[in-house]
């Protein structure tokens, strides 16, 4: 069974300082799946951020950068210049 596990449950971030979120894939090779990232905000709305390769949701391309690290079997999401509006719960997901 495939499992995607966040590296940290909580990530403290400073405004304007780049931050990195990581998800580790257990049981399978990450490169053979498409990785997706979403953000859930207070209104319980799930918003699409990124999908491999280089597909971004509206308004996310300039400040977010998605990637995978196949040598560590990780999905990575970088927030280049975090602000208060980036607060929320981030989810990684995969599909084929």
């Amino acid at each position: 069974a495939i499992e995607l596990v966040p590296e940290h449950q909580t990530v403290p971030v400073s405004i304007g300082v780049p931050a990195t979120l990581r998800c580790s894939m257990k049981g399978e090779a990450i490169g053979n799946y498409y990785i997706n990232w979403y953000r859930k905000t207070q209104g319980n709305t799930m918003t699409f951020i990124y999908r491999e390769k280089d597909i971004y949701g509206p308004g996310f391309k300039d400040n977010f950068q998605g990637d995978i690290d196949i040598a560590k079997n990780l999905a990575v999401l970088k927030i280049l210049a975090p602000s208060e509006r980036d607060e929320g719960s981030y989810y990684c997901a995969c599909d084929t």
């Epitope: 490169g31 053979n32 995978i68």
Partner: antibody, heavy 122, light 112 residues
Framework: EVQLVESGPGLVQPSETLSLTCTVS????????WNWIRQPAGKGLEWIGR???????NYNPSLKSRLTMSLDTSKNQFSLKLNSVTAADTAVYYC????????????????WGQGTLVTVSS | QSVLTQAPSVSGAPGQRVTISCTGS?????????VKWYQQLPGTAPKLLIY???DRPSGVPDRFSGSKSGTSASLAITGLQAEDEADYYC????????????FGGGTKLTVL
């Protein structure tokens, strides 16, 4: 036993396109990463690029503008095309399987083809 | 010019112990990427000797061992045998580009 066999022309004209195919037997092409690596005579190994079973690719930046890799899961094959070749592209070309070992959390090349010599000359 | 640096050659007499070093940087070996070692006998394809810095695939004799510290790694061969004469390559990944594979330039081992 997993076997990888490279095939394609041994001689390519300068400025033409080098085309190679790697046929995989003994296991499915799914679940692994598939790579091309080359070695000029008497020199070291140079990674060319890889293709995933999603069709996504990673290319060596020094070759990226000339490189195309593709995958045919139905034939258990993957291919390399390198255009605008010069004498500097003369080398033994290897295809190799890259395996993610979840038990040891390591990624490595576990099976290689025997290699095929491609000479670029008129 | 290879990203990982290896001595071009090393030699030893049968029965001796030799080490082959591989030096990287903070963007590859030092970025917590593990090191693999491959043996290439004359006229053949490379063969995996060590993965995960220290692990040996089945069939590789325990005379071969690997280690890693900081931005460097080493391959040690004990009880040197004539059939160990080959080229040895270290390999890792580089954090600056997605999935970028880096090799050492290779070390030629001569058994005297």
């Amino acid at each position: 036993e997993v076997q990888l066999v490279e095939s394609g022309p041994g001689l390519v004209q300068p400025s033409e396109t080098l085309s190679l195919t790697c046929t995989v037997s003994g296991d499915s092409i799914r679940g692994y990463y598939w790579n091309w690596i080359r070695q000029p005579a008497g020199k070291g190994l140079e990674w060319i690029g890889r293709i995933f079973t999603t069709g996504n690719t990673n290319y060596n930046p020094s070759l990226k503008s000339r490189l195309t890799m593709s995958l045919d899961t139905s034939k258990n094959q993957f291919s390399l095309k390198l255009n605008s070749v010069t004498a500097a592209d003369t080398a033994v070309y290897y295809c190799a399987r890259e395996k993610w070992d979840s038990s040891s959390s390591a990624l490595y090349f576990d099976f290689w083809g025997q290699g095929t010599l491609v000479t670029v000359s008129s | 010019q290879s990203v990982l640096t290896q001595a071009p050659s090393v030699s030893g007499a049968p029965g001796q112990r030799v080490t082959i070093s591989c030096t990287g940087s903070s963007s590859n070996i030092g970025a917590d990427y593990d090191v693999k070692w491959y043996q290439q006998l004359p006229g053949t394809a490379p063969k995996l000797l060590i993965y995960g810095n220290t692990d040996r695939p089945s069939g590789v004799p325990d005379r071969f061992s690997g280690s890693k510290s900081g931005t460097s790694a080493s391959l040690a061969i004990t009880g040197l045998q004539a059939e160990d004469e080959a080229d040895y390559y270290c390999q890792s990944y580089d954090s600056r580009l997605t999935g970028y594979v880096v090799f050492g330039g290779g070390t030629k081992l001569t058994v005297l």
